[in-house]
């Protein structure tokens, strides 16, 4: 962008605002809430945008926990804290001291306690099972021509590589994406799956973060696939740590 | 060419409000951000919040948060910087800039006194 | 907050000779692309001057002898031969999130 386009915006992220005085005189888009500068060139990370999100509260998500180990997002909408390079702090505290650990999607995987609690290291989440229902259709979708696009989705509208989406299955009308990504597999440059997935689940709600694009259009061999619910479970590198009372609950 | 032009100087009592006026011109006043800065007397200066004009998205310093209150009128081309409840320690020169923070025009400042 | 620390508090120099300010953030304000560091001089009863943007852009305007440099979280701000309208105070300040935290000062004054 140059200082020329009167009206820079960022096709990333429209929890931006844009302006023409970044380095040289070209456009520089700012987080809302953080004012962070981001790079329109690739998707912003969660935190960032949950964030932004924070500054226009909307209706929190509440998700279901389906064992011991996979996490889901319960808690629902926070201001989260964010790190200098837009990633989650491993330790999170709300207005009232209460404090509790996150992992790298922003997830709580601890007890909540208070402003003594310690969170040594944000854990990576390296597994990401993205759980979806479509809405009837006509008959099965093909599951190779499924596979085939909706890595398609994630390689060409979220920039992930293909080789982090690990597997697509399909059980009409269910339809199962698996994203994994070690530390050690991410380079620099690489998008987070976790980040991925925000996006993928933001998009299936018609909630899209995209500038000025239309919302997801998905279609299988030019078929409307519909997503009517959408479940996300988080598995991290280290178990999470809950108290045997939250496990027996 | 661009100019921000503040309002005059301003004597108020504790616990009163002041409003500094910021009239921009000479760019398109809707694109860019405006900065608010403090300075106390013979002190550095202090980040007090922004506005950006074309959708009236603010940010504020937490330290002035609910008591500084950041406006745009852009019929009007003009920012404003309210603070509430003065106190003796307000007493300083505000600033208005036209910037994210590398603020590269600034009004020519009001100086704002409290004092009973 | 992103602290930022000026160094010296003030700097005498001779006319012609060369003067360095510092300014050390207390978390890096740099992306592999570009440094969120400004610096600005201001005048007694003038507004603040932006000198350099970015770290190491010299505003248009600004004389050449001023040159900005650092990355990460230290920066220095030289000027390569000292004129007597170089007398201010200058300060560094950030923008890589809120609130964009200005360093303490340093006033430069002539030996």
């Known amino acids: 962008h140059t200082a020329a386009q009167d009206n820079c915006t960022c096709p990333t992220n429209k929890m931006t605002v844009c302006s023409p005085d970044g380095p040289g005189g070209r456009c520089q888009c700012r987080a809302l809430g953080s004012g962070v500068a981001v790079d329109c060139s690739t998707l912003t990370s969660e935190c960032l945008l949950l964030k932004a999100r924070m500054s226009a509260p909307k209706n929190a998500r509440t998700l279901v926990r389906p064992n011991e180990h996979a996490l889901v997002d319960n808690d629902g909408l926070y201001d989260p804290d964010c790190d200098p390079e837009g990633r989650f702090k491993a330790r999170q505290c709300n207005q009232t001291s209460v404090c509790w650990c996150v992992n790298s999607v922003g997830v709580r995987r601890t007890d909540k306690g208070d402003l003594s609690l310690r969170c040594d290291e944000l854990v990576r989440t390296h597994h990401i099972l993205i759980d979806l229902r479509h809405r009837p259709t006509a008959g099965a979708f093909n599951h190779s021509d499924l596979d085939a696009e909706l890595r398609r989705l994630f390689r060409e509208r979220y920039r992930l590589h293909p080789k982090f989406v690990a597997a697509v299955h399909y059980e009409q009308p269910t339809i199962q994406i698996e994203l994994r990504q070690n530390t050690s597999q991410k380079a620099a440059g690489d998008v987070d799956i976790g980040d991925a997935a925000y996006y993928f689940e933001r998009d299936v709600k018609g909630e899209s973060l995209f500038q000025g694009r239309g919302g997801l259009d998905l279609r299988v061999r030019g078929e409307p696939l519909q997503v009517e619910r959408t479940l996300i479970y988080y598995l991290d590198e280290i178990p999470p740590k809950f108290s045997m009372k939250r496990l027996t609950a | 060419q661009v100019q921000l032009v503040q309002s005059g100087a301003e004597v108020k009592k504790p616990g009163a409000s002041v409003k500094v006026s910021c009239k921009a011109s000479?760019?398109?006043?809707?694109?860019?951000?405006i900065g608010w800065v403090k300075q106390a007397p013979g002190q550095g200066l202090e980040w007090i919040g922004d506005i950006y004009p074309g959708g009236g998205y603010t940010n504020y310093n937490e330290k002035f948060k609910g008591r500084a209150t950041l406006t745009a009128d852009t019929s009007a081309s003009t920012a404003y910087m309210e603070l509430s409840s003065l106190r003796s320690e307000d007493t300083a020169v505000y600033y208005c800039?036209?910037?994210?923070?590398?603020?590269?025009?600034w009004g020519q400042g009001t100086l704002v006194t409290v004092s009973s | 907050d992103i602290v930022l620390t000026q160094s010296p508090d003030s700097l005498a120099v001779s006319l012609g000779e060369r003067a360095t300010i510092n300014c050390r953030a207390s978390?890096?304000?740099?992306?592999?692309?570009?440094?969120?560091m400004h610096w600005y001089q201001q005048k007694p009863g003038q507004p603040p001057k932006l000198l350099i943007k970015y770290a190491s852009n010299l505003e248009s305007g600004v004389p050449d002898r001023f040159s900005g440099s650092g990355s990460g979280t230290d920066f220095t701000l030289t000027i390569s031969s000292l004129q007597a309208e170089d007398v201010a105070v200058y300060y560094c300040?950030?923008?890589?999130?809120?609130?964009?935290?200005f360093g303490g000062g340093t006033k430069l004054e002539i030996k």
């Open positions: 000479g760019y398109t006043f809707t694109n860019y951000w």
């Open positions: 300040q950030h923008s890589w999130e809120i609130p964009y935290t």
């Open positions: 800039a036209r910037g994210t923070g590398g603020g590269d025009y």
């Open positions: 978390q890096s304000v740099s992306t592999s692309s570009y440094s969120y």
